[in-house]
């Protein structure tokens, strides 16, 4: 089973665009666009801070931490109204992701 050029293996993703805005003090806004080839029952999400195919139920229920979106050793918490999640590093630094 060979993949054509540009074709993704089932269940995998690739980043196709990334943008960082550091114009605001003490705040960096990062946006990322990914292309995913998800299997039936999966949808594009984030695992270990990278684009990944995740169980579609996670997206439907907005249980974002079930994607395991944070790096190993970080703590994941849902934002109010389940509008996204935070990843808290051992040192206390917090990274917030909002879903749009």
């Amino acid at each position: 089973q060979f993949l054509k050029e540009g074709q993704l293996a089932a269940g995998t993703c690739e980043v196709i665009a990334a943008h960082r805005d550091s114009s605001q003090p003490r705040r960096t806004i990062a946006r990322q666009t990914a292309r995913c080839a998800c299997r039936k029952g999966q949808i594009a999400g984030t695992t270990r801070a990278r684009p990944a195919c995740v169980d579609a139920r996670i997206i439907k229920t907005k249980q974002w931490c079930d994607m395991l979106p944070c790096l190993e050793g970080e703590g994941c918490d849902l934002l109010i109204n389940r509008s996204g999640w935070t990843c808290t590093q051992p040192g206390g630094r917090i990274k917030t992701t909002t879903v749009s």
């Epitope: 089932a10 269940g11 990944a52 139920r57 996670i58 931490c65 079930d66 994941c76």
Partner: antibody, heavy 120, light 107 residues
Framework: QVQLQESGPGLVKPSETLSLTCTVS????????WSWIRQPPGKGLEWIGY???????NYNPSLKSRVTISVDTSKNQFSLNLKSVTAVDTAVYYC??????????????WGQGTTVTVSS | DIQMTQSPSSLSASVGDRITISCRAS??????LNWYQQTPGKAPRLLIY???TLQSGVPSRFSGGGSGTDFSLTITSLQPEDFATYYC?????????FGQGTKLDIK
Amino acid sequence: QVQLQESGPGLVKPSETLSLTCTVSGGSISSYYWSWIRQPPGKGLEWIGYIYPSGSTNYNPSLKSRVTISVDTSKNQFSLNLKSVTAVDTAVYYCARVNPFGYYYAMDVWGQGTTVTVSS
Amino acid sequence: DIQMTQSPSSLSASVGDRITISCRASQSISTSLNWYQQTPGKAPRLLIYGASTLQSGVPSRFSGGGSGTDFSLTITSLQPEDFATYYCQESASIPRTFGQGTKLDIK
């Protein structure tokens, strides 16, 4: 170094409920998925199910009507309940950590296993 | 459910030999395949994930390959501690299914 330890009764009577607990030490239960697997005497491995940090689950359809997996993050434990057991449920039961290696979910840390015999 | 079929079911070999175990999925699973080693009385140990990536701490004499429906595990220069039962497992669908196992023993 993450370690898993299964605990629970080694003997269960037919028609009763098998209850096992897996205690996770050396790491947070919230950062992974967790799984139960069993192995009948002299046979191969059978996947029972997963649990996610939120408590959401995926079960093997062959056992779905009888199985419940739950998580207690405050105790760093997850549990297996299998109701209405019969002799065919006699097996070594393993708990395992499910690691998302990029896109490839694999069970990379296992408990040592606990033998459960179903007999009157 | 996806069925996983291993061959052979048992295999006899000698220390220093090179052996290959095959695993076939009943439908395409891309490279979502793991290999485990189990010695008697012990829990399984992850050897390879993603069909070909060696798990940390696993000796380089182990290698995996394949994609789609056909996969293989190769051990070059067998060591005494390699005589065990080997299982493949797919991670593409629910339920996760294992192959029936391949028992490798000393000739």
